[in-house]
């Protein structure tokens, strides 16, 4: 997990989230996303 402080004076928390592809489809392997401020953006 990484934490970045911006000039605006507040902190934005970035967290890598990993899901298994087979939970959402038929593929295997892992899906990696990025959560910023509570929202998964990638």
């Amino acid at each position: 997990d990484a934490e970045f402080r911006h000039d605006s004076g507040y902190e934005v928390h970035h967290q890598k989230l990993v899901f298994f592809a087979e939970d959402v489809g038929s593929n295997k392997g892992a899906i990696i996303g990025l959560m910023v401020g509570g929202v998964v953006i990638a």
């Epitope: 989230l17 990993v18 899901f19 298994f20 592809a21 087979e22 939970d23 295997k28 892992a30």
Partner: nanobody, 124 residues
């Protein structure tokens, strides 16, 4: 939820190997992605590895990639963690945990069932 019981911990020399086992009770075992976490003395609990419900997919923390192997046997309701090339920094209590499908498998909050842990000490 499932009940989880770890075994296989112990004292091992640097460079050695251990195999941890996690026995699960409950008929819904194959509904859960399974993970291993560890907690070193004075530190937080950290993700180690996870295996998908089918056992086909796995994911590892960078610190153990290439040294540890996670697997599962759904016919025995058991998850394994084969640990090779152990280092002193691998010393920790190792916990088995279960996460329901569709949740992020690398974060602690996804896991709602936990074992009591088994201690692994790597020292000469």
């Amino acid at each position: 939820e499932v009940q989880l019981l770890e075994s296989g911990g112990g004292l091992v020399q640097p460079g050695g190997s251990l195999r941890l086992s996690c026995a699960a009770s409950g008929r819904t075992f194959n509904n859960y992605n399974m993970g291993w976490f560890r907690q070193a003395p004075g530190k937080g609990r950290e993700f180690v590895a996870a295996v998908s419900r089918s056992g086909v997919s796995t994911y590892y923390a960078d610190s153990v990639k290439g040294r540890f192997t996670i697997s599962r046997d759904n016919s025995k309701n058991t998850v394994y963690l084969q640990m090779n090339s152990l280092r002193p920094e691998d010393t920790a209590v190792y916990y088995c945990a279960a996460a329901y499908r569709g949740t992020a498998i690398n974060v602690r909050r996804s896991y709602d069932s936990w074992g009591q842990g088994t201690l692994v000490t790597v020292s000469s």
